[in-house]
């Protein structure tokens, strides 16, 4: 009765195809599985970027994984070869780990990598990336940055950069097509007669980075004797009305009378006949059923009504 | 296993120029960078360069009129090339491979006496 | 260029005790560029502890490291004979690389 074993998977490795962080994970079947032909050998995979507490795991019968990753940052990744307890007549056998490492040799001292980058999908519409050079680098350093997104055949450069001083110090994107809800990958290096320059990693997704523009057409209407409904309409653009959050400021008589979040085109408000002015203003972001983040869009032109009845009149901007 | 070892001449008269090989093992010189450092009684420890996985190099900007690092990625060597040496650099110059941002082994370093 | 400022120069300690040392950046540096290198004498340097708080292979539990910015220390939770060594911190962050002047500890 001797004990059933199998052997890990051959030519492990991961493999860069040049995403920007999309790297491939693969690897070939164990040697001898010559006595388990009537068998689906499975694979347990595990991977992560060094220094990440968690392993991620995948159970799969097939010879390849993908994934993304930070670059910036080493990746670890192991995978035996699991028998089902089908092929074994008992319980499942593993095999022992085999394991891989991937990282991009650096170059530079940290400090010539760009500082602050931010980067802003404005009104769901055109995303625009900007950062700070890194400390110490000279004015002949210039930084590239190339992207990438599942749906283009290879990383593209920026072709229309910000520049200050001669120096690359941001990116309008073009059109992206069919680009949100998946990883968006950046590379921004650089280069410079004096020293070499760190490349810098980014990814994120563009529906987590819309700053809506504001909302507009700003009106009052008297609902009752004591009761004024504020209404606005969403910002043209492609974001949908059921996209948004709303936060209203009120002032009534130069105090702020309240701030409030409403995920509606409108806002009823408590009022008295005392009050001699009322203003408000609103803001827009995309809300959680469209996204995960977003950032606040500035605040609308500001709409007021002033010493008269607002029964009889409904103002309009 | 990872092993790093420096060889360099020992004595060096004043104003002459300074030359240490730094011969590396286990593992690829097109896969890590190396770095120079120096540790003296009056200084401490020192960082003087590094040669880069991909051929480029850092220096520390106070002495980059007097270094030159080099490499030869088929032999497994960095070479350390000082020009001017004063009595200041009298030294144990040390060779370290890169890896994430540290230092993760060094050699066991080559005593340089510049003196007359 | 970033000063390294380590303290005490010198300390020493009783098997058992709890020993802690600092180190003190003349400008901020990123944790994850902030190390510790361990010598004995007539031998050199060992990577300690890395990016402030992650041990190198082979350094005993007893050992931890923490801080940000310009503010960083070392830890040993209960001394022992073969602590004794001079430590050094080190950034890696901005250029030049820069290097404590290390603490000395001695075993009392």
């Known amino acids: 009765d001797t004990e059933i074993k199998v052997n890990p998977p051959q030519d492990f490795e991961i493999v860069d195809p040049g995403y920007l962080g999309y790297l491939y994970l693969q690897w070939q079947p164990p040697l001898s599985l010559d006595h388990f032909k009537e068998c689906t050998v499975e694979y347990e995979l595990k991977y992560r970027n060094i220094g990440s507490e968690t392993w991620k795991t995948i159970i799969t019968k097939n010879l390849h994984y993908k994934d993304g990753f930070d670059l910036n940052k080493g990746i670890e990744a192991k995978i035996h070869t699991l028998l089902p307890w089908q092929c074994t007549n008992g319980s499942e056998v593993q095999s022992s780990w085999a394991e891989t490492t991937y990282w991009i040799s650096p170059q530079g001292i940290p400090e010539t990598k760009v500082q602050d980058m931010d980067c802003v999908y404005y009104n769901w519409q055109y995303l625009l990336c900007s950062w700070k050079p890194g400390i110490g680098v000279l004015l002949d350093t210039n930084y590239n940055l190339f992207y990438w997104y599942e749906g283009l055949d290879h990383a593209l450069q920026c072709v229309d950069y910000i520049k200050a001083d001669g120096q690359n110090i941001g990116c309008r994107f073009p059109y992206l097509e069919a680009s949100d809800y998946k990883d968006f990958y950046i590379c921004v290096n650089g280069s410079s007669e004096n020293k070499p320059i760190r490349s810098s990693y980014f990814t994120f997704q563009l529906q987590n980075i819309v700053k809506p523009l504001p909302p507009v057409y700003l009106t009052f209407t008297r609902e009752s004797s004591c009761e004024i409904k504020l209404k606005w309409s969403i910002p043209l653009g492609p974001i949908p009305a059921r996209c948004f959050d709303y936060e209203i400021e009120i002032r009534e008589d130069d105090t702020t009378l309240v701030t409030a979040t409403v995920e509606n085109e409108t806002y009823t408000l408590k009022t008295t006949n005392e009050t001699r002015q009322l203003c408000f203003v609103v803001r827009s972001k995309v809300n959680i059923y469209c996204s995960d983040d977003g950032i606040w869009s500035e605040w609308s032109d500001k709409q007021c009504w002033e010493g008269e009845d607002l029964s009889k009149k409904t103002l309009l901007r | 296993q990872v092993q790093l070892k420096e060889s360099g001449p020992g004595l060096v008269a004043p104003s002459q120029s300074l030359s240490i090989n730094c011969t590396v093992s286990g593992f690829s010189l097109t896969k890590y960078g190396v770095h120079w450092i120096r540790q003296s009684p009056g200084k401490g420890l020192e960082w003087l360069g590094v040669k880069w996985a991909g051929g480029s190099t850092d220096y520390n900007s106070a002495l980059m009129s007097r270094l030159t690092i080099s490499k030869d990625n088929n032999k497994s060597q960095v070479f350390l090339k000082m020009n001017s040496l004063q009595s200041d650099d009298s030294a144990m110059y040390y060779c370290?491979?890169?890896?994430?941002?540290?230092?993760?082994?060094w050699g066991q370093g080559t005593s340089v006496t510049v003196s007359s | 260029q970033v000063v390294l400022t380590q303290s005490p120069a010198i300390m020493s300690a009783s098997p058992g005790e709890r020993v802690t040392m600092t180190c003190t950046a003349s400008l901020s540096v990123s944790s994850t560029y902030l190390h510790w290198y361990h010598q004995k004498p007539g031998s050199s340097p060992k990577l300690w502890i890395y990016s402030t708080s992650n041990l190198a292979s082979g350094v005993p539990a007893r050992f931890s490291g923490s801080g940000s910015g310009t503010s960083y220390s070392l830890t040993i939770s209960s001394m022992e004979a073969e602590d004794a060594a001079t430590y050094y911190c080190?950034?890696?962050?901005?250029?030049?690389?820069?290097f404590g002047s290390g603490t000395k500890l001695e075993l009392k």
């Open positions: 080190h950034q890696y962050h901005r250029s030049p690389l820069t």
């Open positions: 370290a491979r890169d890896h994430r941002d540290a230092m993760d082994y």
